[in-house]
């Protein structure tokens, strides 16, 4: 029995946040070969879908407004009881998000963290937001929930991640909410990627001609490894996006990504990263540092890759 | 700074129409929802709901189902409350306020409804 | 509805004496309250919020206590342009609802 002797167990997929219009099926677990079960509301706003009905297996909620945010239960079908019906479930919070602007979502130190550090998620507002939430894509599990704090016309709240696992690697956004309607949240904040370092072997960074260019020349980096990756990373030195490429089968049996970096103009430092498909956001450890130098030009920085790069979709499958 | 900018008052006789705006500045008019709030002659303070800026949802309280409407226009930054069907008893001072712990006021809109 | 309970209704007090007005929540609002001061032909002025939060500008005579239905707002000194209607209002549940004020007078 899932949810004890006499209590089924009521969960919510996808997940229990729900944007607005969305769907989400609710499904009552009780005892097998009892599936009928009623669904309740705890609370006085009216979702007049459930008076007096029973459901089958599970049920579909949507498009759902902002008074289908709240706490249900359900009770599951029990013929030869004295009232019909099982003891009330568990508790199942569902909240529906776009009902105010949304709030931004920061990582300190960085979005890439080695395996077993901490992270600190900040959700902060100018909407006076009362609670923050933290939740992560794919996860069916109530989003952690933190007091905003308000200084100097923000609202804000730390989330503290970690040590960090595989597990806890993932695309991550957060909402706000005001007091007097808790589980109407708000716009989701932009995603923010964490990913975790540290978990494979490093693979090896090279530059062709070499890593003192003249400027102007065309230069291209070469991130390679024996380990299969699927996937390279290239990140720069004080700059918060990365490029990717699908990794090369090489004849020499190394898997190997060429980044054309164009022609040189200024320096950097950079560094590569392998990961697997399965696991978009766990990569190796970091390849060893390599300095670029372009000589004939100041060592400033360096221009943005002409290709968009964007702050998310790192733990998107690259297709 | 944070202002709130409401109409001036009216006087109108019972079963007619009132429309009260209230301009806001300073701010980003979508991150507060708007509050409206009624004070009688003599009587304390009421809530009548409020409007949600971003979403454009109204809540009203019990007592302002039906008659009181809460709209928005939101390029002006503005929101408004109408009373349809005007009695005696709507005569009051009314306020809008922002944000969820009323943050800001304004001044008031006096509304006499007699004949 | 929840009922704010606010007392006294009205009182007098002298310049420089410490005031303190109560409000009582009919169920557990969390620290979810405001108060207000209102005088004639004014706007009406926000002095607290989350219970004890002094909102920026207001003189730090005026703090705010309290957690779940016991809630106070004190005036340490008064002075003359403290007189005036206060109210409490709770915004922990729609509807809000409002205290029935209290009328401070000058002796």
């Known amino acids: 029995l899932m949810g004890g002797q006499d209590k089924p167990f009521l969960s919510a997929r996808p997940s229990t946040v729900v944007p607005r219009g969305g769907h989400v099926a609710l499904q009552c677990h009780y005892r097998r070969g009892f599936n009928n079960f009623m669904l309740y509301k705890e609370d006085r706003s009216h979702v007049p879908i459930f008076h007096g009905r029973i459901f089958q297996e599970s049920f579909i909620m949507g498009p759902v407004t902002p008074a289908h945010a709240g706490t249900y239960r359900c009770r599951g079908s029990r013929p030869h009881s004295l009232t019909g019906w099982s003891a009330p479930s568990n508790p199942l919070v569902i909240m529906v998000t776009g009902n105010h602007r949304k709030p931004s979502l920061l990582a300190h130190p960085g979005p890439l963290v080695k395996s077993g550090e901490r992270v600190i998620l900040q959700c902060w507002s100018d909407v006076m937001f009362e609670h923050f939430f933290l939740h992560r894509e794919g996860i069916s599990e109530d989003p952690s929930r933190l007091v905003g704090q308000i200084h100097d016309g923000v609202s804000k709240a730390n989330f503290s991640i970690g040590p960090l696992m595989p597990v806890l690697a993932g695309t991550y956004r957060c909402y706000g909410s005001v007091p007097h309607s808790p589980y109407q949240l708000s716009a989701p904040s932009d995603p923010l990627d964490i990913v975790i370092t540290g978990l494979y072997e490093k693979p090896s960074l090279s530059a062709q001609p070499g890593p003192t260019v003249q400027a102007g020349e065309n230069v291209t980096l070469s991130c390679s490894s024996w380990s299969s990756y699927d996937i390279y990373h290239l990140s720069r030195e004080g700059e918060a996006h990365e490029r990717r490429l699908r990794a090369v089968p090489k004849v020499n049996r190394t898997f190997q990504a060429d980044f054309p970096l164009g022609p040189a103009t200024h320096g950097g430092t950079y560094r590569c990263f392998g990961s697997f498909r399965a696991l978009p956001c766990v990569w190796s450890n970091s390849s060893d540092p390599l300095l670029v130098s372009v000589t004939g030009n100041p060592s400033s920085s360096w221009p943005s890759p002409t290709e968009p790069s964007s702050k998310s979709g790192i733990c998107r499958h690259l297709h | 700074q944070i202002q709130l900018v409401q109409s001036g008052p009216e006087l109108k006789n019972p079963g007619e129409t009132v429309k009260i705006s209230c301009k806001a500045s300073?701010?980003?008019?979508?991150?507060?929802?708007m509050n409206w709030v009624k004070q009688a002659p003599g009587k304390g303070l009421k809530w009548m709901g409020w409007?949600?800026?971003?979403?454009?949802?109204?809540t009203y309280a019990d007592d302002f189902k039906g008659r009181f409407a809460f709209s928005l226009e939101t390029s002006a930054s503005t929101a408004y409350l109408q009373i349809n069907n005007l009695k005696n008893e709507d005569t009051a001072t009314y306020f809008c306020?922002?944000?969820?712990?009323?943050?800001?006021w304004g001044q008031g809109t006096l509304v006499t409804v007699s004949t | 509805d929840i009922k704010m309970t606010q007392s006294p209704s009205s009182m007098y007090a002298s310049l420089g004496e410490r005031v303190t007005i109560t409000c009582k929540a009919s169920?557990?609002?969390?620290?979810?309250l405001s108060w207000f001061q209102l005088k004639p032909g004014k706007s009406p002025k926000t002095l607290i919020y989350?219970?004890?939060r002094l909102v920026d500008g207001v003189p730090s005579r005026f703090s705010g206590s309290g957690s779940g239905q016991d809630f106070s707002l004190t005036i340490s000194s008064l002075e003359c342009e403290d007189m005036g209607i206060y109210y409490c209002?709770?915004?922990?549940?729609?509807?809000?609802?409002f205290g029935g004020g209290t009328t401070l007078e000058i002796k």
């Open positions: 306020a922002h944000g969820p712990w009323l943050a800001y």
């Open positions: 300073g701010y980003i008019f979508t991150n507060y929802g």
């Open positions: 989350r219970a004890n």
């Open positions: 209002l709770q915004y922990d549940e729609l509807p809000y609802t």
């Open positions: 409007i949600n800026t971003y979403t454009g949802e109204p």
């Open positions: 169920q557990d609002i969390n620290s979810y």
